[in-house]
């Protein structure tokens, strides 16, 4: 807490300018009017204040706005944003995407800080849903943003926002997150033709059920191995050898290198060896010829 001291004669700041960098902390406190600071926040960024001086400026704004800063000030915080605590930010009501962009720009190139996470949370909650423009902005700054959300939070993403998602935005998503996102993507891209649809839906397929994979296998899509390896094991297991062959097209040749990894390993164990042999890759571990396969899950469902 800076002690309240009178401003020396002739030191009263008529405006926010470079002369203030020569002010001591107590002089800034005494000689800069908080209301003036609030109206001229856009100038602060252009002045090379020390961290200590920024602390004083923040303190003045805190006194002026104890219930939280107005958006007109927030939008021009610039580097002063880095001085804010999550508690400060929780008092804000940020509704403008421009304000969000301006503050994210300040933190650009760094990990998502607790301040940024709080800001985004406040912004999204204020909007009620994660709309396309917001998602576009957030994934541009933080490609991993989408995958940092819980399945519950993701459920508020409208299908229309899925158009903003790029493949790299889903790189760190786990199956539970893709389970939520896939149906939204399917809905968003439903009017596209076969090959265009596959290009868009491909990165969401980690959430696809068996019946959708079977349908894709009828469409000449040539799914690559990297995508196949990210599919849900339970969705892959019921696929026949013929369906996998059709689904992967020329990429089926890559199954051999992946035969010890999931979901390929588990899928091989469910196939007849005779059928696996038709792939021409020497895949081993299928059900020997002449063995009877009982589908116990079907039996349980009937009893």
């Amino acid at each position: 807490e800076v002690e309240k001291t009178a401003c020396p004669s002739g030191k009263k700041a008529p405006e926010i300018d470079e002369s203030l960098i020569f002010y001591k902390k107590w002089e800034l406190e005494a000689c800069v009017d908080a209301a003036l600071l609030a109206t001229q926040m856009d100038r602060v960024n252009a002045i090379p204040f020390t961290y200590e001086q920024l602390d004083v400026l923040k303190h003045k704004l805190d006194e002026l706005y104890p219930q939280g800063y107005p958006e007109s000030v927030i939008q021009h915080l610039g580097y002063l944003f880095l001085k804010m605590s999550p508690e400060d930010i929780r008092k804000w009501n940020v509704t403008s995407l421009e304000t969000l962009k301006a503050l994210l720009e300040v933190n650009k190139g760094h990990e998502m800080s607790p301040q940024v996470a709080t800001l985004i949370d406040r912004f999204v909650k204020g909007r009620g849903q994660l709309d396309k423009d917001t998602l576009d902005t957030l994934t541009a700054f933080y490609p991993g943003y989408l995958c940092s959300l819980s399945p519950e939070e993701l459920s508020s993403v409208p299908p229309s926002s899925i158009w903003a998602v790029r493949p790299q935005d889903l790189d760190t998503c786990d199956p539970r997150q893709l389970d939520v996102l896939y149906p939204k993507a399917r809905l968003a891209f439903q009017n596209m033709n076969g090959s265009e649809y596959f290009v868009k839906i491909q990165s969401f397929l980690g959430g696809a059920p068996t019946e959708d994979l079977k349908a894709l296998s009828q469409q000449n899509v040539s799914m690559d191995l990297a995508t196949f390896m990210k599919l849900r094991t339970d969705a892959v297991l019921p696929l026949t050898v013929a369906e996998v062959q059709k689904l992967l097209g020329p990429h089926v040749e890559g199954l051999k290198a992946e035969e010890r990894h999931r979901p390929v390993r588990d899928w091989i164990l469910r196939q007849r060896q005779d059928d696996l042999d038709t792939l021409g890759l020497g895949l081993q571990g299928g059900i020997p010829n002449g063995y009877l396969v009982l589908d116990l899950s079907m039996q349980e469902a009937l009893s």
Epitope: D224, L225, H251, E253, K256, A257, L279
Partner: antibody, heavy 121, light 107 residues
Framework: QVQLQQPGTELVKPGASVKLSCKAS????????MHWVKQRPGQGLEWIGN????????YYNERFRSKATLTVDKSSSTAYMQLSSLTSEDSAVYYC??????????????WGQGTTLTVSS | DIQMTQSPSSLSASLGGKVTITCKAS??????IAWYQHKPGKGPRLLIH???ELQPGIPSRFSGNGSGRDYSFSISNLEPEDIATYYC?????????FGGGTKLEIK
């Protein structure tokens, strides 16, 4: 040891077709796909396509789809490539190659000696 | 398709010297690159796979490096039998593609 045997030369007239062979030995023929590669005089190597020897399903480089037809005869462990409507552009050395599936889609660890195809009237 | 741009197309070096050839892929190939030596009248000979893994029986004078889109191949302590054309091959995609080749001559 693994061997891929190809005839040394073929001389064919323009407009005709030719069927090049590649006889495999020293491994289980139906456990590895067979690939074909073209090399024109003074040029680099170009992948033509491959075939699953177990079910006879081929995949082609788009550039060769209307030129080459890949087939296999499992009983003799032989892969074939038929080239149709031959022109001087088809004069080249054609290699068959077997992949090793250690990682990804596999690199070629065994090659035939190549068949030199000459298209001339 | 993935394009492989190989350079230089030819080079000349002295016995005992060292040469380096590069291949640049049109997209990330995750180190799935192999290098071949090719002499007239023979099939290509595999030297290196997965960027830097030497094939059994290949002398350690041959080496490879790289990641992402950029890869290199070197031969040190050049010997007369190294005269050949060298090719890179990407196998990150089932539709394999080769580099244009580098013809190595000895000064």
């Amino acid at each position: 040891q693994v061997q891929l045997q190809q005839p040394g030369t073929e001389l064919v007239k323009p407009g005709a077709s030719v069927k090049l062979s590649c006889k495999a030995s020293g491994y289980t023929f139906t456990n590895y796909w067979m690939h074909w590669v073209k090399q024109r005089p003074g040029q680099g190597l170009e992948w033509i396509g491959n075939i699953n020897p177990s079910n006879g399903g081929p995949y082609y480089n788009e550039r060769f789809r209307s030129k080459a037809t890949l087939t296999v005869d499992k009983s003799s462990s032989t892969a074939y490539m038929q080239l149709s409507s031959l022109t001087s552009e088809d004069s080249a050395v054609y290699y068959c190659a077997r992949p090793y599936y250690g990682s990804s889609y596999g690199y070629f660890d065994y090659w035939g000696q190549g068949t030199t195809l000459t298209v001339s009237s | 398709d993935i394009q492989m741009t190989q350079s230089p197309s030819s080079l000349s070096a002295s016995l005992g010297g060292k040469v380096t050839i590069t291949c640049k892929a049109s997209q990330d190939i995750n180190k799935y690159i192999a290098w071949y030596q090719h002499k007239p009248g023979k099939g290509p000979r595999l030297l290196i796979h997965y960027t830097s893994e030497l094939q059994p029986g290949i002398p350690s004078r041959f080496s490879g490096n790289g990641s992402g889109r950029d890869y290199s191949f070197s031969i040190s302590n050049l010997e007369p039998e190294d005269i050949a054309t060298y090719y890179c091959l990407q196998y990150a995609n089932p539709l394999r593609t080769f580099g244009g080749g580098t013809k190595l001559e000895i000064k």
